[in-house]
């Protein structure tokens, strides 16, 4: 019987190919050179290795690169990425957006795993900021990505990146996150004309202060109720009945359906009944 640590005669791998799927785990360990594996990583994904065999291949790479894999290997990990732990990924230095895309593709359609979260964190920290191309990529794979960041992390997003943000990317953002994003959006869209500006800024308005809402009320924007409901309570309370009427335009009638909900309820409570009556909606302060 051949010793398990020695490669059987004639079995030494000359290249990474389909013949390796018939190798036992110990044979892969003994007969596949780690340096060969590293240079031919792109072939691994085309071969239907078992999970156990992939474990062996990962082990070989770990031994070859104890300080972390080089990007040339990382870019071609493919399904082997699913075998990586967050601890493994913390050793990497990923700088190429193509590498990031390749690894996100492996996890596509699944929830953001701890591995992916670590990968993204390493990538963004390496770049120093969340630039537009990165944000485009991340929100394409994970629409909720932006809202998974802390307000502190969002502060590193440059205003230019805001152009990549779609309304659905902000669906799960909380008020503190919108407080950070709104001033960036305001800066990014500042040179647009009134109606175009409102279309772009609308999904960020949950972070808008009172004075900006007052300014919008003078521009015939016809804000819908869904947007109004997401406004900051402290920004809505000082608005007069006339200002809310101008802000909402024809949508003002929708206040009746939302009169028991915040922030509409808080606003109604603080208005003079005579002023509310001018709306003709039967709102009771």
């Amino acid at each position: 019987e051949v010793e398990k640590t020695a490669c059987p005669s004639g079995k030494k791998a000359r290249e990474i190919d389909e013949s390796l799927i018939f190798y036992k785990k110990w044979e892969l360990e003994a007969c596949v050179d780690a340096a060969l594996l590293a240079t031919q990583m792109d072939r691994v994904n085309a071969i239907p290795f078992t999970y156990e065999q992939l474990d062996v291949l990962k082990h070989k790479l770990d031994e070859l690169y104890p300080q972390g894999y080089p990007e040339s290997v990382i870019q071609h990990l493919g399904y082997l990425f699913l075998k990586m732990s967050p601890e493994d990924i913390r050793k990497w230095n990923v700088t190429s957006l193509e590498t990031l895309k390749a690894l996100l593709e492996v996890n596509k359609g699944h929830e953001m795993s701890p591995q992916v979260a670590t990968l993204i964190d390493r990538f963004v920290k390496g770049r120093g900021q969340l630039d537009k191309d990165t944000l485009d990529t991340l929100t394409a794979f994970y629409p909720g990505y932006l809202c998974s960041l802390s307000p502190e992390e969002l502060s590193s997003v440059p205003p230019s990146s805001i152009w990549a943000v779609r309304p659905q990317d902000l669906d799960t953002c909380d008020p503190r996150q919108l407080d950070v994003l709104y001033p960036k959006a305001r800066l990014a869209f500042q040179n647009m004309n009134g109606s175009e500006y409102f279309v772009k800024i609308q999904s960020f308005l949950g972070g808008a202060p009172t004075e900006d809402l007052k300014a919008l009320s003078q521009q015939n924007v016809s804000m819908d109720l869904a947007t109004f409901m997401k406004l900051r309570t402290d920004a809505v309370l000082p608005l007069t009945v006339a200002e809310v009427q101008k802000l909402l335009g024809p949508h003002v009638e929708g206040l009746k359906a939302e009169e028991r909900h915040r922030p509409v309820r808080d606003w109604i409570l603080r208005q003079r009944q005579d002023d509310l009556d001018t709306l003709g909606l039967g709102l009771q302060g």
């Epitope: 909380d174 008020p175 503190r176 409901m229 997401k230 309570t233 402290d234 309370l237 028991r260 909900h261 915040r262 309820r265 808080d266 409570l269 603080r270 009771q284 302060g285």
Partner: antibody, heavy 119, light 107 residues
């Protein structure tokens, strides 16, 4: 520093009216940003919101208690009050008054007063 | 009324443990969700408001997250003084409602 203090009888007979008052000190009941609530907690059970009042006199009550509850405010005394009519043993609870700051939640509470409904 | 469902209703944990309590609303309440801590014989204390904002004076080991219908209160490293009952409360709808509470006990 705003403080709240509940006062009222600790024992009420069934079918009678429970009356409690909450005195606000260190702040004004007429604050633009605050509503003033009553919340109760039966022994060993969870919290139940009863209702709130704004200094203008506007009120909002828990639908399950609405027919029996009246909350009023006296801005001159810096107080607000709770009246709960036709009480039964099920109304036995610790009654709390609390400030509801519009930008947060019930951020200031009274220490609570135990009210027992028994003949 | 909007129903608030907390889970678990009780849990046992040790000092230093990471503890997570969840709260689910029967319909969307945006971010209008508060968390309170109550110790026996005391009034509740506001910990987190607007789902994720830490109330002044509350230790940073407490954090909240979520929006819509699903919310979480996390205590990153449980301290002896954290053994208490925790309640969530929605203030989106005019009829305020509390969750049933989660009692955190010493293991």
């Amino acid at each position: 520093q705003v403080q709240l203090q509940e006062s009222g009888p600790g024992l009420v007979k069934p079918s009678e009216t429970l009356s409690l008052t909450c005195t606000v000190s260190g702040g004004s009941v007429s604050s633009f940003t605050d509503t003033w609530s009553w919340i109760r907690q039966p022994p060993g059970k969870g919290l139940e919101w009863i209702g709130y009042i704004y200094y203008s006199g506007s009120t909002n009550y828990n639908p399950s208690l609405k027919s029996r509850v009246t909350i009023s405010v006296d801005t001159s005394k810096n107080q607000f009050s709770l009246k709960l009519s036709s009480v039964t043993a099920a109304d036995t609870a610790v009654y709390y008054c609390a400030r509801d700051f519009v930008l947060s939640g019930f951020d200031i509470w009274g220490q609570g007063t135990m009210v027992t409904v028994s003949s | 009324d909007i129903q608030m469902t907390q889970s678990p209703s009780s849990l046992s944990a040790s000092v230093g443990d990471r503890v997570t309590i969840t709260c689910r609303a029967s319909q969307s309440i945006s971010s209008y969700l508060n968390w309170y801590q109550q110790k026996p014989g005391k009034a509740p204390k506001l910990l987190i408001y607007a789902a994720s904002s830490l109330q002044s004076g509350v230790p940073s080991r407490f954090s909240g997250s979520g929006s819509g219908t699903d919310f979480t209160l996390t205590i990153s490293s449980l301290q002896p003084e954290d053994f208490a009952t925790y309640y969530c409360q929605q203030s989106y709808d005019a009829s305020y409602t509390f969750g049933g509470g989660t009692k955190v006990e010493i293991k």
